[in-house]
């Protein structure tokens, strides 16, 4: 049979019976739960039939009295069986055995769920000692269930080698729904179906679930925990809980806000990090991901000149270092430059426009059609050229440099020559005679010294030659010249 | 397969009361709330309000509160819609339809034309 | 309450037409669903949720929307597509429906 205890206005009474201190009696529910300490009685079952010791684990003591009777076998009385009682509440329980006086040493264990308890819990055991037994009383509080303090509770006394357990008491601590797993912020994607799940537990069990988006319920009648929820789709952003409902009341999840993946936002702030001749290193900071994470980026370069076709080039690049460096460009030159991210969702707009300039450059071609020839009179060599075109001039030419090398029986000095800008012509004189002269010519702007032209060479005669021609760049592709005098 | 089945059509007398019923089949009848929508003679359709099959709460909108009681018998999972002290104007068909998640009208019966004349 | 309004209440078209019927709430809502009516029967779920077809229902029928402006397209009509079609909104209590429009085909 089932006995229950519910709430009532007085507590129980703890151990009334013949000994100090309260032991209790068979047919009496080992629970009190007095109204002025602050506990709330609890409803109990007790599982056995009220007045028997039970049959599980007892010692049968080998030892006889006096008068050569056998001891009866040791067992713990029986006790409740089941206490529910709800969270936060306290509870005190107890096991209690009449132990022969022959006994000594004899100890009470608490054991929960198979291990023992040790250390801070509220246990305290009563000995009351009789002519020929004593009465030993166990007694286990906890002063604020929790869950965790949900089980199995089991006495353990050891005598003669011999182990006697006591019948389990169940403790079963109620609440409010506990959430095991809550819906999950997520970013998705516009009108497109999706998942959220919500489970908590009791006990109390049942637990049922309600969803709620943006404050009003999507299943009006209870779904069962676990439940999930198919979305099926969403426009714009929305926030979800779910409710969770049991027999002590209502607990209700964090809200989650669920956002609509969108192309992102421009990036801002679009920098110049470094200028050289040809390249242009730029920084951004990205715009607003879309809830979207970047995928790469797009830098977008025009020419400024009005004069240009208008023409854009484009780079693609990762989305991380949120830097660039865009290569190719020429010198001296003004661009307007912008950046667009890309997500899963498609490209931003691109950035504001920022202007940029490149540096000066070293030319990037040498003077064309140089020409060498032998002014014998004046003993000097003469040398002509044309300066390289605008566009490959990389800057504001300031000049030229000429490099010519002598050569001679095992002899060979390089001597180089600075002329100014406006010139496209210089004269150098002879260094050595019976030998040879090449002549290279470079253009030089603020930016450095472009390349040097291909070689030309003359041979100057000793004195009193009088032949002579001049000696010129050759077409591309050819040998060098020599010209023999 | 669901279905909802509801009972014939009635003709009553002003003052009168009527019964109508909806019979569901092929789902677990305290999973899904049951709804009843008005449809007057040549016009749309008017949602009176539903039925919470798990508790028996009733919720009625507006229009529909005090002649009109929503209740339930789950034992045969039936669903019935009573309206006390009839007008002319209660003329109309009356459909029953559950709805799961976001209230969408999945399933409907048949609808039960309720005539009221002298 | 949210009300619905639908426009038009009445249109008459040829087969093969495309057709488009709005329904506009007089604040938003979260979803729309749209509904069926052929003559002496019952309404019939063809959307739900603003852009989701109903299970059965042919894929010339779509819905699309949000906050206060939603659309029923039936792309190619056919001739079984006469009937009146209702809008419902979820999101705000009570549930409303709009007052129809009624499809006749020419």
């Known amino acids: 049979a089932i006995t229950e205890a519910r709430e009532e206005a007085k507590p129980y009474p703890l151990f009334p019976g013949p000994f100090p201190g309260s032991l209790q009696t068979d047919h009496t529910p080992l629970l009190s739960l007095p109204h002025a300490s602050g506990y709330q009685p609890a409803l109990m079952f007790s599982p056995t039939q009220p007045g028997r010791p039970h049959t599980g684990n007892v010692a049968i003591p080998q030892v006889t009295s006096v008068e050569s009777k056998p001891l009866p076998p040791l067992a713990f009385k029986h006790t409740v069986g089941h206490i529910i009682l709800s969270e936060h509440k306290g509870v005190k329980f107890n096991c209690s055995i009449s132990v022969p006086n022959i006994y000594q040493d004899t100890t009470i264990s608490w054991w929960k769920d198979g291990k023992e308890l040790l250390g801070a819990h509220h246990a305290i055991t009563q000995f009351y000692p009789d002519d020929e037994v004593t009465a030993i009383i166990a007694s286990f509080s906890i002063t604020s269930v929790q869950r965790s303090d949900n089980g199995s509770y089991i006495c353990k006394m050891k005598i003669n080698n011999e182990e006697i357990v006591s019948d389990p008491i169940y403790i079963e601590v109620q609440g409010l729904p506990h959430f095991t797993k809550q819906p999950e912020s997520m970013n998705v994607t516009r009108n497109t179906a999706f998942n959220l799940t919500c489970q908590a537990v009791g006990p109390p069990e049942p637990v049922n679930i309600f969803w709620v988006q943006n404050s009003s319920r999507v299943n009006e009648q209870p779904e069962k925990s676990p439940s999930v929820l198919t979305v099926p789709g969403l426009t714009e952003m929305a926030v979800f809980s779910c409710e969770a409902h049991n027999d002590k009341g209502l607990t209700v999840s964090k809200g989650v806000q669920i956002n609509i993946k969108a192309i992102p936002s421009p990036p801002t702030e679009v920098s110049i990090r470094n200028s050289t001749a040809h390249s242009i290193l730029i920084s951004w900071v990205p715009g607003f991901d879309g809830y979207s994470p970047f995928r790469n980026c797009s830098i977008q370069v025009k020419e400024a000149d009005p004069l240009s076709n208008g023409s854009v080039m484009i780079f693609n690049t990762s989305a991380l270092p949120h830097l660039y460096q865009i290569k190719q460009l020429q010198a001296l030159a003004n661009y307007s430059i912008g950046v667009s991210c890309m997500n899963e969702i498609g490209w931003s707009a691109v950035s504001p426009w920022i202007l940029a300039s490149t540096t000066e450059g070293a030319p990037s071609v040498a003077p064309l059609n140089v020409t060498v020839f032998l002014n014998e009179s004046s003993d000097n060599v003469d040398i002509r050229w044309m300066k390289p075109p605008t566009k490959q001039q990389d800057g504001e030419l300031v000049g030229y440099r000429i490099s010519h090398v002598w050569q001679s029986a095992g002899i060979s000095k390089e001597l180089l020559e600075e002329v100014g800008q406006n010139g496209s012509r210089a004269r150098i004189s002879v260094q050595v005679h019976n030998a040879t002269c090449t002549v290279r010519i470079a253009a030089v702007t603020r930016g450095g010294v472009g390349p040097f032209s291909d070689p030309v060479k003359i041979f100057i005669p000793a004195h009193g030659w009088v032949d002579y021609a001049p000696s010129s760049t050759p077409a591309p592709g050819n040998a060098d010249p020599v010209l023999i005098i | 397969q669901i279905q909802l089945v509801q009972s014939g059509s009635e003709l009553k007398k002003p003052g009168a009361s009527v019964k109508v019923s909806c019979k569901a089949s092929g789902y677990t009848f305290t999973n899904y709330g049951m709804n009843w929508v008005r449809q007057a003679p040549g016009q749309g359709l008017e949602w009176m309000g539903w039925?919470?099959?798990?508790?028996?709460?009733?919720t009625y909108a507006d229009d529909f509160k005090g002649r009109f009681v929503f209740s339930l018998d789950t034992s045969v999972s039936t669903a019935y819609l009573q309206i006390s002290s009839l007008k002319a104007e209660d003329t109309a068909v009356y459909y029953c339809a559950t709805y799961g998640h976001y209230a969408w009208f999945a399933y409907w019966g048949q609808g039960t034309l309720v005539t009221v004349s002298s | 309450e949210i009300v619905l309004t639908q426009s038009p209440d009445f249109q008459s078209v040829t087969p093969k037409e495309k057709v488009t019927i709005t329904c506009r709430a007089s604040s938003s809502v979260s979803y729309m669903h749209w509904y069926q009516q052929k003559p002496d029967q019952s309404p019939k779920l063809l959307i739900k949720a603003t852009s989701n077809l109903a299970s059965g229902v042919p894929s010339r029928f779509s819905g699309s929307g949000s906050g206060t402006d939603f659309t029923l397209t039936i792309n190619s009509l056919e001739a079984e597509d006469a009937a009146t079609y209702y809008c419902?909104?979820?999101?705000?209590?009570?549930?409303?429906f709009g007052q129809g429009t009624k499809l006749e085909i020419k």
């Open positions: 039925i919470n099959t798990y508790t028996g709460e009733p």
């Open positions: 419902q909104q979820w999101g705000t209590k009570p549930l409303t």
